[in-house]
């Protein structure tokens, strides 16, 4: 049977087993999510994309999954990130009272995975999936992350932090998930301030990256939404990573 060849990598191998195993592990670790039925979660996840054209996925397709994965995180402890996922995740692993999207059930389930199906067949496509640029934006993975990212940003309150990669040419990228989704879904009636942490490449880089034109662009977007903006240069990824390796060290109690 002829199969559409997409430009992106195919579904992650053992995708169903991985999602199910992650769900079980997450609900074991997080008592507040123990009520979640992981088989139902997988069924809802599968139902969002199986038998559907992988360029015609909508946010509505994911609503059953969103409902099952409803989770309350402290709205004033949210950490967003852009192009610096590993460091953000390492941070919340040590700084346990802050949360990235991938620290929530739905984010945890899908982190680093790819998936898609085929129109009118119950098969999962392990050969190829649509690439966001080359094929289509309404693909299963992109729509999933757009949906959960929007909900995550909408839940945020008080001071929201975002970790940005100061080593990239565009420190703030309007086309990133943070720039295209999360920034526009922070609720001005709930969020007082967005504080950007610009992570420098090393201790020797003494520039003020908060002056970067893309950061000024972010400040403009946020200010127009009646949310205050602040930015801090963070010069110590070396020290930071030392604490990730040795989180029990008494010197690794973050003071923010």
């Amino acid at each position: 049977r002829w199969r559409q060849q997409w430009s992106g990598p195919g579904t992650t191998k053992r995708f169903p087993e991985t999602v199910l195993a992650r769900c079980v592990k997450y609900t074991e670790i997080h008592p507040e999510m123990r009520h979640v039925d992981c088989q139902s979660v997988w069924d809802a996840f599968k139902g969002a994309f199986i038998s559907k054209h992988p360029c015609n996925i909508t946010e509505e397709d994911y609503q059953p999954l969103m409902k099952l994965g409803t989770q309350t995180v402290p709205c004033n402890k949210i950490l967003l990130w852009s192009r610096i996922k590993d460091l953000a995740h390492q941070f919340t692993q040590v700084q346990r009272d802050m949360f990235t999207l991938e620290d929530t059930l739905l984010g945890y389930l899908a982190d680093d995975l790819t998936w898609c199906g085929e129109f009118n067949t119950s098969k999962i496509n392990y050969q190829s999936c649509p690439d966001w640029r080359k094929d289509c934006s309404n693909n299963p993975v992109s729509v999933f992350w757009k949906t959960v990212s929007r909900r995550f940003a909408e839940a945020a309150c008080d001071v929201v932090h975002v970790m940005l990669n100061g080593s990239r040419s565009k420190i703030f990228d309007k086309n990133s998930t943070f720039g295209s989704v999360e920034v526009h879904n922070l609720q001005p009636e709930k969020v007082q301030t967005l504080e950007a942490w610009v992570i420098h490449g090393g201790r020797e880089d003494s520039r003020d990256l908060c002056q970067d034109p893309t950061i000024k662009e972010l400040e403009s977007i946020i200010s127009k939404r009646n949310i205050q903006f602040s930015c801090k240069n963070i010069y110590r990824p070396d020290k930071f990573l030392q604490c990730v390796k040795n989180p029990e060290d008494s010197s690794c109690t973050s003071e923010i």
Epitope: S206, D208, C210, Q211, I234, Y235, S254
Partner: antibody, heavy 121, light 106 residues
Framework: QVQLVESGGGLVQPGGSLRLSCAAS????????MNWVRQAPGKGLEWVSG????????YYADSVKGRFTISRDNSKNTLYLQMNSLRAEDTAVYYC??????????????WGQGTLVTVSS | DIELTQPPSVSVAPGQTARISCSGD??????VSWYQQKPGQAPVLVIY???NRPSGIPERFSGSNSGNTATLTISGTQAEDEADYYC????????FGGGTKLTVLG
């Protein structure tokens, strides 16, 4: 409780050398980056040098680069500052300080009482 | 490196509010700490990360930082608060302000 005790200060001639020590107790020394900060008589504070928790990275103010060497012995809970080619402008009280604020910010939560270094002929 | 500028001296009557400024180009983009130093003694950390107070520091000490100025505020100043105060920041190297002598009048 945290204690930092400096020693090794004294009077030295210009061009001479001196080695300062800082004995640490009351905390896990090997977990913390450590620093030397100095204060000339009647003047403000000036950061001199810093060293990472395991000694793999060292940092110096431009004013002492090439002349001073910071080191540590974690088995002895001791921080050192080897000062060579001393100048009159190095005259100061030298404080040993523990670096805190591991992730996003850096500051000195604990200081020793200081040791006076006088460079004069 | 960033340069931090403090007024050499500030005077305040007991019970009044003392404000000590620390100015620097876009200092709000950097975390600022404050130290108190009494004559013949080592510095003591009174504020870190712009506005956080270490345990044991009285509530009358507070800090703020935005734009080009960081401020240490001492409300209900007491005679024992008379000391030199230094701001400090970090941009790949540690930088201190020149210090401010706080005099409590009377």
């Amino acid at each position: 409780q945290v204690q930092l005790v400096e020693s090794g200060g004294g009077l030295v001639q210009p061009g001479g050398s001196l080695r300062l020590s800082c004995a640490a107790s009351g905390f896990t020394f090997s977990s913390y980056a450590m620093n030397w900060v100095r204060q000339a008589p009647g003047k403000g504070l000036e950061w001199v040098s810093g060293i990472s928790s395991w000694g793999s990275s060292t940092y110096y103010a431009d004013s002492v680069k090439g002349r001073f060497t910071i080191s540590r012995d974690n088995s002895k809970n001791t921080l050192y500052l080897q000062m060579n080619s001393l100048r009159a402008e190095d005259t100061a009280v030298y404080y040993c300080a523990r670096e805190d604020g591991s992730y996003m910010t850096d500051y000195f939560a604990y200081w020793g009482q200081g040791t006076l270094v006088t460079v004069s002929s | 490196d960033i340069e931090l500028t403090q007024p050499p001296s500030v005077s305040v009557a007991p019970g009044q509010t003392a404000r000590i400024s620390c100015s620097g180009d876009n200092i709000g983009h950097y975390y600022v700490s404050w130290y108190q130093q009494k004559p013949g003694q080592a510095p003591v950390l009174v504020i870190y990360s712009d506005s956080n107070r270490p345990s044991g520091i009285p509530e009358r000490f507070s800090g703020s930082n935005s734009g080009n100025t960081a401020t240490l505020t001492i409300s209900g100043t007491q005679a024992e608060d008379e000391a030199d105060y230094y701001c400090q920041s970090y941009n790949g190297t540690y930088v201190f302000g020149g210090g401010t002598k706080l005099t409590v009048l009377g």
